[in-house]
Interface confidence: medium
Amino acid sequence: PEPPTACREKQYLINSQCCSLCQPGQKLVSDCTEFTETECLPCGESEFLDTWNRETHCHQHKYCDPNLGLRVQQKGTSETDTICTCEEGWHCTSEACESCVLHRSCSPGFGVKQIATGVSDTICEPCPVGFFSNVSSAFEKCHPWTSCETKDLVVQQAGTNKTDVVCGPQDRLRA
């Protein structure tokens, strides 16, 4: 019979012969022959192949590098790659999420109006009168000044947008 010039789906042509492709999650060890089937082996740990293939090496799972602000969203299998996403406070620089951009922290005197999302930066707002922030944070809102009155104390030092009020004891009139 004439040697085939094309093969069925999930087959490949080699040495004028149609061999079965390896299934996802497996790599090619040896091509089929007239007498033997295609030999395939499962991918190792931290490796994958996501298609019917004739690859002799599996692909390494993507590494979600925390140094780039990445974390694992979905762990890879022998048939799928690891999916990375950004740590809270970071957002992806591309659809493939190969690295993240650090969202800005709000400086003292400013609080977080909206925590960063995967697509938007931190929105900071100045602390209004009666509120303060003494930290540099990607998460903290402005905090209200301490109410001295509710503690039966008086304001000894006024608060600012960066500092809380300082409360002290009420002056007692001596007889």
Partner: nanobody, 116 residues
Framework: EVQLLESGGGLVQPGGSLRLSCAAS????????MRWVRQAPGKGLEWVST????????YYADSVKGRFTISRDNSKNTLYLQMNSLRAEDTAVYYC?????????WGQGTLVTVSS
Amino acid sequence: EVQLLESGGGLVQPGGSLRLSCAASGFTFSVYDMRWVRQAPGKGLEWVSTISSSGTYTYYADSVKGRFTISRDNSKNTLYLQMNSLRAEDTAVYYCAKYPKNFDYWGQGTLVTVSS
């Protein structure tokens, strides 16, 4: 000079608990968000948890959610990680790090081994 000194690691059986500490010095600890990361033997770094400067906001990797609790004591300049229901896959060297800086400053880490 910024210093981060992790402690509290050790050998623990599966299902057991440990509390890690990170003593910070050389910077105003209470002003910064902080985080824990870990590195399992032969693996890359993995983010574990983040806590905001006052401790109001906390975030966790899915792999530790419900089992680990991050906290801080700003008066003691110390960051903590309470680890419960430990599993073999939690075996790693644990590091604390100042957020948002990437890893400019490293402690020596503390090794947690979960094994029966």
